[in-house]
Interface confidence: low
């Protein structure tokens, strides 16, 4: 149980106030984290509060400004990147968001040795992606879907690709579906460790169907946005991987990396690329039916200037109970012999654990084990492996950092974070310097977040990087809700839940209940993290109890729970929310006539289905940007969990799992449907179809659209959205305004 600091004395109580909606919308109680921008084993960069770029040397304790705020301001720079030889900095301005990760920008190169901007051979604008080589100051960038290379910032560019074309051929950057559902990056190019080679992906979207929607803007006629977007079962992008020698790029040109035969025999995806050495690269491929993944290690053949991927260096990962991997197939972390690697995948008991692969996957040595999951491998050095897991005290919603000494036999395991600030910090991530000489720990809660710097050898805390003192002081006179994390055992299923309780919670009283749900495959909502957000306000000021439940399909509790939803999305996720609500009612403090559910995206889908479950449990609910039919969503995501919408595969469940099919069941609930018209991700089409089905069934409902807003409903729309949802819930729960 995590109890937020409570105030005991009545005199103190009087000076304290509840959270307001304005607090939330203004971000009054937002926290800061500190992630060092490591540039060596003992040095990092950080942008100071006054916008100077400062280099810190941990060992000397010295810091100095490498780039002044004056220089930053001269080009309205919002971001920077130092070249590895420390001679140049790129300054990024005119940021223009595209999709989740992608954006375009204008780039200026500042010459630190001369103290001026590089002039001549300047970069074109806007650039889709730009990065330094890992050594020296070479630049690779993508402009108009083609890749260019500069040996030095002031040199003329060398054009690597020539076939790039908007919405057709993408070089070095992903198309929409690869960005959102496979790579989770804005880039699709990778420098080799010493900058000798540059690998890149080419995506051919020529045959992909296009989603088109109106962008209303301010003009007389709306613009039409066209995005090649493969929905479930549609034609997918065709991907090819090339590698070019950046020292002599014109010599042999880009060389294609062969696709493993067992992958190439049918539709497939490229999932990630990992450089091992300058002349060894590891590619991961995935069948379109995403239960077979192949990791292929390829070597540079100097004599032919080609890349060879021997079958003996192909490692197959297959799932017989679900899809391959968790949300994504994990990526390997190679050891210093440059052939063996560490990787997270399911063990024989169905828990994701770290394995060491030396020759074949079959002969993998399991490094971690237990009824918990290893979540991320941060760093492998010659003597240590750092990873995160949720092992400690058997709370799946925690994250602690562990070190395994791989240099000694038998390897010994140490929890680096478990006992550091036990009450305050139970959910960590980490950022390591080169050779793990130093690392930063970022604690996200459940207490106020804190970032600290540590010695990579001794794990000793060196200093606090950010402790959010201002936030701590600001919260001193705020009545925060209490939070508890517990579990329900139902029919051999463990349902972890987080309950957010009003500050003066009294078990003998009855409270309205709001379920906040996401519930997507491999997600986790019940986490030991700090947050002062909309639901905090609803508990603090409006006296609601809010609950989040991780049901079947959610992550980090083993494959049985995770893969339970395989090929049948929209069934167990909903059942488990309903089961939890019934258990909450049994606890005795829930007013069963005032229960609501809300969710966004996948959560909007689950909340809609829960409202239409016919249980009579829910008085009202909200769906923000919901999926309404899996036929409308992206192929890569949807087919991972649902297979194909074909008669001989899983069309029947595609049809059965729509929100529209349950339109009739919305008759006895109050339903608020919300969507942005420019949602590139979950298309407005989804809500349009729900609305149409409800109208056709003559079911009353409420709706709100946000013109020209995407899946995030940002800016002023956010304020409007939460104000609108608050009114809706207060009305539903008969709470006075």
């Amino acid at each position: 149980i995590v109890l937020r600091p409570s105030r005991v004395h009545n005199s103190e109580e009087n000076t304290m106030r509840a959270l307001t909606l304005k607090d939330i919308l203004n971000g009054t109680f937002s926290y800061k984290t500190f992630f060092p921008n490591w540039i060596s084993g003992q040095e990092y960069l950080h942008q100071s509060a006054d916008n100077n770029i400062v280099l810190y040397n941990i060992e000397t304790g010295q810091s100095y400004t490498i780039l002044s705020n004056r220089t930053m301001k001269s080009v309205n720079a919002s971001n920077y990147g130092l070249s590895p030889d420390r001679q140049f900095v790129y300054l990024e301005s005119d940021y223009s968001k595209l999709w989740r990760y992608s954006y375009t920008a204008t780039y200026y190169i500042y010459d630190l040795s001369n103290g001026e901007f590089v002039r001549g051979n300047e970069l074109p604008r806007p650039i889709q992606y730009l990065c330094w080589s890992p050594v020296g100051s070479k630049l690779a960038y993508v402009y108009q879907n083609n890749i260019y290379l500069k040996q030095r910032p002031g040199d003329p560019p060398f054009q690597i690709t020539f076939n790039g074309r908007e919405n057709k051929i993408f070089n070095g950057i992903p198309d929409w579906v690869y960005e959102e559902e496979m790579l989770a990056t804005k880039y699709a190019l990778w420098w080799s460790p010493n900058g000798k080679f540059l690998a890149y992906a080419e995506f051919n979207d020529t045959d992909i169907p296009v989603i088109a929607y109106s962008y209303y803007g301010d003009e007389q006629y709306p613009r039409t946005i066209n995005i090649p977007y493969p929905k479930a079962g549609a034609k997918n992008p065709v991907v090819r991987i090339f590698i070019i020698d950046t020292t002599y790029p014109a010599y042999v040109g880009p060389q294609e990396v062969p696709v493993p035969a067992m992958i190439a025999s049918s539709d497939y995806y490229f999932s990630w690329l990992t450089w091992v050495t300058d002349e060894r690269v590891c590619l991961q491929w995935l069948k379109r039916v995403q239960n077979v993944s192949v990791l292929s290690i390829c070597d540079f053949r100097e004599d032919w200037q080609t890349w060879d991927c021997p079958k003996t260096q192909e490692h197959i990962e297959e799932s017989r109970t679900g899809w391959a991997g968790g949300f994504f197939v994990s990526t390997p972390v190679f050891s210093y012999d440059a052939i063996s690697y560490y990787k997270i995948f399911s063990d024989k008991d169905g828990y994701k654990h770290i394995h060491y692969i030396k020759d074949t996957v079959e002969n993998a040595i399991q490094i971690t084990s237990g009824k918990w999951e290893a979540i991320n491998i941060f760093r492998v050095t010659q003597d240590s492996l750092f990873y995160s897991s949720n092992e400690f005290e058997e709370y799946p919603g925690r994250r602690n950092i562990y070190r395994i000494s791989i240099g000694s036999y038998p390897p010994s395991k140490k929890c680096v974070t478990c006992h550091l600030r036990k009450e305050r910090c139970q959910y960590y991530t980490a950022s390591f310097s080169d050779y793990a000489k130093y690392y930063a720990l970022v604690c996200y809660g459940p207490g106020i977040p804190i970032s600290t710097l540590h010695d990579g050898r001794t794990d000793q805390e060196i200093k606090i990087l950010e402790e959010n003192k201002e936030l701590e002081n600001a919260l001193k006179n705020i009545q925060l809700p209490k939070e508890e994390i517990k579990k329900l055992e139902v029919d051999e299923i463990t349902l972890w839940y987080k309950m957010i309780l009003p500050p003066q919670f009294d078990r003998s009283k009855k409270y309205p209940l709001l379920i906040q749900v996401y519930g997507g495959p491999c997600s986790q909502s019940v986490r030991s993290v700090f947050a002062v957000n909309w639901i905090s306000y609803l508990a603090s000021k409006e006296g609601m109890v809010i609950a989040l439940v991780d049901g079947r399909g959610t992550a980090f509790q083993g494959d049985k729970l995770l893969y339970a939803v395989y090929r049948k999305l929209g069934v167990y996720e909903v059942e488990d929310q309903i089961t939890a609500v019934r258990k909450f009612i049994e606890m005795g403090f829930i007013d069963e006539k005032r229960i609501a559910i809300w969710g966004w995206s996948y959560g909007g889908y689950v909340s809609s289905l829960a409202l239409a479950s016919g249980t009579g449990l829910f008085k009202c609910g909200i769906a923000v940007a919901p999926v309404s039919s899996w036929e409308y969503y992206a192929s890569v995501y949807t087919e991972r969990f649902m297979g194909l919408p074909t008669k001989d595969d899983n069309l029947e469940h595609y049809k059965n799992s729509t929100v529209m099919a349950r339109a009739e069941y919305f008759r006895n609930v109050d339903y608020l449907l919300i969507h942005g018209t420019a949602d590139d991700n979950v298309h407005f089409q989804n809500s349009a179809q729900i609305a149409k089905a409800l109208v056709n069934a003559q079911v009353d409902f409420q709706a709100m659209w946000y013109s020209d807003q995407n899946h995030g409903l940002s800016g002023l729309s956010t304020n409007h959205l939460y104000t609108h949802m608050t009114h809706f819930l207060k009305q539903c729960f008969s709470l006075s305004d």
Epitope: D85, V135, G136, R152, D383, D434, K437
Partner: antibody, heavy 120, light 108 residues
């Protein structure tokens, strides 16, 4: 003041072994990578071996791979070069050198050198 | 490996003269090039790193320039103590770290 003092040189026969040491002072030894560089009489400089600050990473020039081993003891502020199966062409003055900054393997401080003579 | 070729092998000059020494790399080394001075029987002394950055305590008559494969060390006005061997070293692509063969600056 930074000081690097090599020792352990001498005259040996081909096939024999020798262990060079380099005692460091005047700087935080454990924070810097170190290298051995040799110079054949009347010839140029040749890099021999590199070791990272913590000793986890070592590199060698091809001609000494498998024969020489670089190591360090940070508690003693000392760098070592174990030379086995010595050959006549290994005859040189051996310098230990301190890297100026991590990632940049050039040397701001050098020892005075120790002479290794391999002769039958 | 990257081969560094220095020219000329010997440079005969008088005190006060300007000395221009060249170091050519067999392939690009970016700006990862250092220059050392070595007087007979002594250890090398770092003059320039990153092609053009003067090391601590080095007089400003020494300057380095160049990038990629062509580098120059310039001594604007030779002092008596400057007559020595000058060696370039690349640290761009290593191992191995490689040195040039050296240029000997002799008194004419």
């Amino acid at each position: 003041d930074v000081q690097l003092v090599e020792s352990g040189g001498g005259v040996v026969r081909p096939g024999e072994s020798l262990r060079l040491s380099c005692a460091a002072s005047g700087f935080t030894f454990s924070s810097y990578a170190m290298s051995w560089v040799r110079q054949t009489p009347g010839e140029g400089l040749e890099w021999v071996s590199f070791i990272s600050s913590g000793g986890a990473y070592t590199h060698y020039t091809d001609s000494v791979k498998g024969r020489f081993t670089i190591s360090r003891d940070n508690s003693k502020n000392t760098l070592y070069l174990q030379m086995n199966s010595l050959r006549a062409e290994d005859t040189a003055v051996y310098y230990c050198a301190k890297e100026k900054e991590i990632w940049n393997a050039f040397f701001d401080y050098w020892g005075l050198g120790t002479l290794v003579t391999v002769s039958s | 490996e990257i081969v560094l070729t220095q020219s000329p092998a010997t440079l005969n000059l008088s005190p006060g003269d300007r000395a221009t020494l060249t170091c050519r790399a067999s392939q690009t080394v970016g700006s990862k090039l250092a220059w050392y001075q070595q007087t007979s029987g002594q250890a090398p002394r770092l003059l320039i790193y990153d092609a053009s950055s003067r090391a601590t305590g080095i007089p400003d008559r020494f300057s380095g320039s160049g990038s990629g494969t062509e580098f120059t060390l310039t001594i604007s006005s030779l002092e008596p103590e400057d007559f020595a061997v000058y060696v370039c070293q690349q640290y761009y692509d290593w191992p191995p770290l490689t040195f040039g063969g050296g240029t000997k600056v002799e008194i004419k």
